[in-house]
Structures are given as C-alpha cells and as structure tokens.
Interface confidence: medium
C-alpha cells in the first residue's frame, strides 16, 4: 500500500487548528463525517462527528472541536480551539459509510502543539484563540460506536483533481473516490 501522506501543523497552546477536508464526491454531501485521532499501535478513535444525515453549514461542537459541513463546497471544516500540548498527534477526517469501513479524506493532519505565548487573542492568522463564539444552534451528534483498524489502503494522490462537468464536456475515466482537489487552506 502507498504510504499515507501527512500535512503538518505547528501551533502554540491556546491557538486554533482550522482545517478543511475535501470530500470531492457529491454522493458524500449528506454522509456522516468524523474527526479521528490515530495513536501509535491503536485503532483510529473518533473524537467528533456530524449528524446523520450531515446537515449543511450546521456547526456541531464536541468539547473543543467544532465541525461544519459545507455541502455547496464539498468541504468539511474542522476546528480545534484552545489547543493544548496534549492535543499533539495524528488526525484524519473520515466519512462513515456503514457497512463499509470509513473513507479517509485528504491528507492526515500531524498536529504539533507547543507551549509558548501566542500573542493577544486573534492576533495570529492561524488562531482564533478561545474567543470564537459558538452559534446557539450548535448541537452534539452521536457517533457510531465502531472504529476501524484501517481506513483506506491507498493514499489520496497529492494535489490532483477530477474534472467532471455537469454537462459531460469532459469524460472521466479511472476516477477513484479518493481525489484531492485544491482548496484554500
């Protein structure tokens, strides 16, 4: 199997991790999505998930984790606010598609949180500190109990993209479910 690629984020305590997971395939728009941590020698552990079916632009908060699924963009936004050193680790976005195993999105995220003064709240472009106000509509969602020992056996190709069009101006061949499309992150 191809080695899974990682994207590294180095942040200070109190800052906010803000990542976008691109799910590319329209069929996944309403699927339940989750944010998982992968610890050495352990199965991925689900920390937070969207509702089932996933609602458009509807924030879900579990502790310091906020998930927002933007169906118009095909993007899942994941934020971990007020980061702590112990949050350091390897994370991934997945789509739950029972009875099949979860489908991994994008590159895995290698988060490194260090101690240190991070400036005034909101002063760092990578940080919203802990001043972010959660909308009152925020809900908690129940995640499936199972976790999978493996997510995918193949890494998403780095920086590639599909080019399907609504009017089939381009014919797609050999398009897999795991395609990375550029987004501003």
């Amino acid at each position: 199997a191809t080695k899974l690629t990682e994207e590294k984020y180095e942040l200070k305590e109190g800052q906010t991790l803000d990542v976008k997971c691109d799910y590319t395939l329209e069929k996944f728009a309403s699927s339940q999505k989750a944010w998982q941590i992968i610890r050495d020698g352990e199965m991925p552990k689900t920390l937070a998930c969207t509702e089932r079916p996933s609602k458009n632009s509807h924030p879900v908060q579990v502790g310091r984790i906020i998930l927002e699924d933007y169906h118009d963009h095909g993007l899942l936004r994941v934020r971990m606010v007020n980061l702590q050193v112990e949050d350091s680790g390897l994370y991934q976005c997945v789509i739950y598609q029972p009875p099949k195993e979860p489908h991994m999105l994008f590159d895995r995220i290698r988060l490194v949180v260090t101690k240190g003064f991070s400036g005034t709240p909101g002063s760092n472009e990578n940080s919203t500190q802990n001043v972010y106000k959660i909308p009152p509509t925020t809900t908690k969602a129940l995640c499936p109990l199972y976790t999978s020992p493996r997510t995918v056996t193949q890494a998403p190709p780095k920086s590639t993209a599909d080019v399907s069009t609504p009017d089939s101006e381009i014919n797609l061949t050999n398009v897999t479910d795991i395609i990375r499309v550029p987004v501003f992150n």
């Epitope: 976008k20 395939l25 728009a29 118009d72 963009h73 920086s159 993209a161 501003f184």
Partner: antibody, heavy 126, light 107 residues
Framework: QVQLVQSGAEVKKPGSSVKVSCKAS????????ISWVRQAPGQGLEWMGG????????NYAQKFQGRVTITADESTNTAYMDLSSLRSEDTAVYYC???????????????????WGQGTTVTVSS | DIQMTQSPTSLSASVGDRVTITCRAS??????LAWYQQKPEKAPKSLIY???SLQSGVPSRFSGSGSGTDFTLTISSLQPEDFATYYC?????????FGQGTKLEIK
C-alpha cells in the same frame, strides 16, 4: 450575472500599506473562492493569494507571505487585499477574480477564474 | 511551485489562420488548467477551464486540449478581435501559477 467591482486607484509612499476592496454585485460569494492577481506594467499575471469567504483564513503565494492579508466579509459580499511594506516594484494593477466550486453530476469541481474585477492601479512612489 | 511555460512567447498570424499555443507544466496537473485572453488595459477574460471546457459565452473557434503536463489552446479561424495576449494557468495546487503569456499579433 455576478460582477466584481474594485475600489479606485491608489498612490502610496514606499513603506506604507494599501487595502483594495472587491465587491460582488448582482450575486453573492456563495460557493466561490476569491483570488487576487497582480500585473506589473508590461509584465504577466501573478497570483498573490486567495480566500474562500465562508472560511476565515487565506492562502498566499510564498513571495507575498507576511506582507499580504486577504480577508472577506460575507455579509457585504466584499473581499479585501491588504499589502504592506510597499516598495516601488509593487506598482501594478491588482485584480480580484472569482473561482466557483460547483456540484456536478457526481463530483465537485472548480471553474477557473471565471469572473474578474476591473482592476485597481496601485502606484508606489516617493 | 509549479512552473508553467508557454510557447511561443509571441506569434504573428493573419485573420482566418489556425493558431496553436502550447503550455507545459513542470509537474502533472491533471486537467486543472485554464486559458485567459487579455487585451491592453483590460482585465483578463476566461476562455477555457478544466483544460478543454469552454467558458460560457466564448466562441466555439476556441478549444483546449491536453492533460498531465502538456496543454494546447487552438483558435480554429482567427478573427480580428482575437489579437491579444493569452495566458495559461494551473489551479491544481497552490500557489496558482500562470504562464508568461503569448502575444498574438497581426501579420
């Protein structure tokens, strides 16, 4: 039909900053990314960075990292490009351009930069 | 960063000619390539996206082809309004990068 309307020409002194705005008229920023592209006199096009307005953080070309800040205000459908520590070589026409992400039959995909602003001339001179 | 190299950098042609401009990416960009036309003192105009899809309202004499690293813009029969500078641009990965441009002049 969405149009991008940019703010007027600016004359700035070296070392100062400039903030150029780009307002979507006749539509919204929904499902779009906004890029900023500049063109120095007699030169080609240069991508500076961009932002998806529903998200707060921009993405910048390495060349401009630390000097450029791109923001967007969804409530007014306006994007902004702030360039600091100006020098004479920043004299250029600055364009905003929209890239739309849409849902196809089975996939999401992007158009190229399908709608452009009229351009804002920034002159840096002492 | 991905480098985009256009050729030729300038081209003289006559009305009615068939013209081809090529663009090469320094690494594979799938079909994430756009072509733009720019006239003096005007903003660029999008012609082609996703390598071969015609942007709405663009005349059918413009066509694009290619994938991976090699791409082509073809104008099947040049019209007087087509004399301009043409740019290719990759949007497969950030930073987006443009070719240096091809100036199409009247022979």
């Amino acid at each position: 039909q969405v149009q991008l309307v940019q703010s007027g020409a600016e004359v700035k002194k070296p070392g100062s900053s400039v903030k150029v705005s780009c307002k979507a008229s006749g539509g919204t920023f929904s499902s779009s990314a906004i890029s900023w592209v500049r063109q120095a006199p007699g030169q080609g096009l240069e991508w500076m960075g961009g932002i998806i307005p529903i998200f707060s953080t921009g993405n910048y070309a390495q060349k401009f990292q630390g000097r450029v800040t791109i923001t967007a205000d969804e409530s007014t459908n306006t994007a902004y490009m702030d360039l600091s520590s100006l020098r004479s070589e920043d004299t250029a026409v600055y364009y905003c351009a929209r890239s739309t992400r849409v849902r196809g039959v089975s996939h999401y995909y992007y158009y190229g930069l399908d709608v452009w602003g009229q351009g804002t001339t920034v002159t840096v001179s002492s | 960063d991905i480098q985009m190299t256009q050729s030729p950098t300038s081209l003289s042609a006559s009305v009615g000619d068939r013209v081809t401009i090529t663009c090469r990416a320094s690494q594979g960009i799938s079909s994430w390539l756009a072509w733009y036309q720019q006239k003096p003192e005007k903003a660029p105009k999008s012609l082609i996206y996703a390598a071969s899809s015609l942007q709405s309202g663009v005349p059918s004499r413009f066509s694009g082809s290619g994938s991976g690293t090699d791409f082509t813009l073809t104008i099947s029969s040049l019209q007087p309004e087509d004399f301009a500078t043409y740019y290719c641009q990759q949007y497969n990965s950030y930073p987006y990068t443009f070719g240096q441009g091809t100036k199409l002049e009247i022979k």
